[in-house]
């Protein structure tokens, strides 16, 4: 039975040209996290394997930095970066947990962070 929950940074906004940290946290389970995948819509940005470490897609290596922790930092943001991002936790023995973050990249300088929320 899957008992865990993923807490994410929720709906967030950031300025064009700036950077943002995408963060997820898995709690309420004793399952072993074997890998975390970061995806944007249908594209795989990066993986972080518990043993082998980070592996960043060459398509994104110039604008994506690993961490902090299991999070992902997006740099040199453009309006095209607006959209859904997913953290996918592969765990043993529970299986897969998925968290969702919506990022809005704004032209203006009044970007504010949204509230944190949980996905069961």
């Amino acid at each position: 039975m899957m008992t865990g929950t993923i807490e994410t940074t929720g709906n967030i906004s950031a300025e064009k040209g700036g950077s943002i940290i995408l963060q997820c946290h898995l709690s309420s389970t004793t399952a072993q996290v074997t890998q975390v995948n970061w995806e944007q819509q249908d594209q795989l940005l990066a993986i972080c394997n518990a043993d082998l470490g980070w592996h960043i897609s060459p398509s994104f290596k110039d604008r994506v930095a690993p961490g902090p922790g299991l999070g992902l930092t997006l740099q040199s943001l453009t309006v095209n970066d607006t959209g859904e991002y997913f953290c996918i936790y592969h765990t043993y023995p529970d299986g897969t947990y998925t968290g969702r973050i919506f990022l809005e990249v704004l032209e203006s300088s009044v970007a504010e962070h949204g509230a944190r929320f949980q996905i069961p």
Partner: antibody, heavy 114, light 107 residues
């Protein structure tokens, strides 16, 4: 030049034990996760163990869990695979592999037979 | 576990031919796919990672591509030294799994 040199293979009876070693050179060993991958005669490839760069985390599939142990000594630039309670189906060439499988050793052969 | 199926155990080709080796994933693994070449008596060597990126020193006649769950390694003009076993691998989900291999041989 990245070099991975395995040793320790041989013929062992079912139920016996072996310890494989992999001597690494040509890169900063302590910065890389490492793996053991095996290839049974005439068969495909199977990942049998992975270990974090600092040795603090390991992962083994159910087929070898409880029988095999992966470890490393970063001061000696060496990776190990301790294999206990060996079975005929463990007969294979065992390869030491760096990181995300970018460099492989030449392999060492383990034969489990009575 | 994700199953990577290489439906052709053998493929016959001639020097200079274009050949495509296919691998089908049992579920979507996005671009987390690598390809390896193994010559007789040797260890596997990484050719392609992240579906389409060539590893250091790999000739540009080797290209990788993806269409949903179908992954393809193409050799644009086969050379004699390309006759070997080819394996795909997924690293989208643990445990990482390999295809059964495709042996490229001369007609």
């Amino acid at each position: 030049e990245v070099q991975l040199v395995e040793s320790g293979g041989g013929l062992v009876q079912p139920g016996g034990s072996l310890r494989l070693s992999c001597a690494a050179s040509g890169f900063t060993f302590s910065s890389y996760g490492m793996s053991w991958v095996r290839q049974a005669p005439g068969k495909g490839l199977e990942l049998v163990a992975t270990i974090k760069s600092d040795g603090g985390s390991t992962n083994l599939p159910d087929s070898v869990k409880g029988r095999f142990t992966i470890s490393r000594d970063n001061s000696k630039n060496t990776l190990y695979l301790q294999m206990n309670s060996l079975r005929a189906e463990d007969t294979a060439v065992y390869y030491c592999v760096r990181g995300y499988f970018d460099y492989w050793g030449q392999g060492t052969t383990v034969t489990v037979s009575s | 576990d994700i199953v990577m199926t290489q439906s052709h155990k053998f493929m016959s080709t001639s020097v200079g031919d274009r050949v495509s080796i296919t691998c089908k994933a049992s579920q979507d693994v996005k671009t987390a796919v690598a390809w390896y070449q193994q010559k007789p008596g040797q260890s596997p060597k990484l050719l392609i990672y992240w579906s389409s990126t060539r590893h250091t020193g790999v000739p540009d006649r080797f290209t990788g591509s993806r269409s949903l769950t179908d992954h393809t390694l193409t050799i644009s003009s086969v050379q004699a030294e390309d006759l070997a076993l080819y394996y795909c691998q997924q690293y989208y989900s643990t445990p990482y799994t390999f295809g059964g291999g495709t042996k490229l041989e001369l007609k």
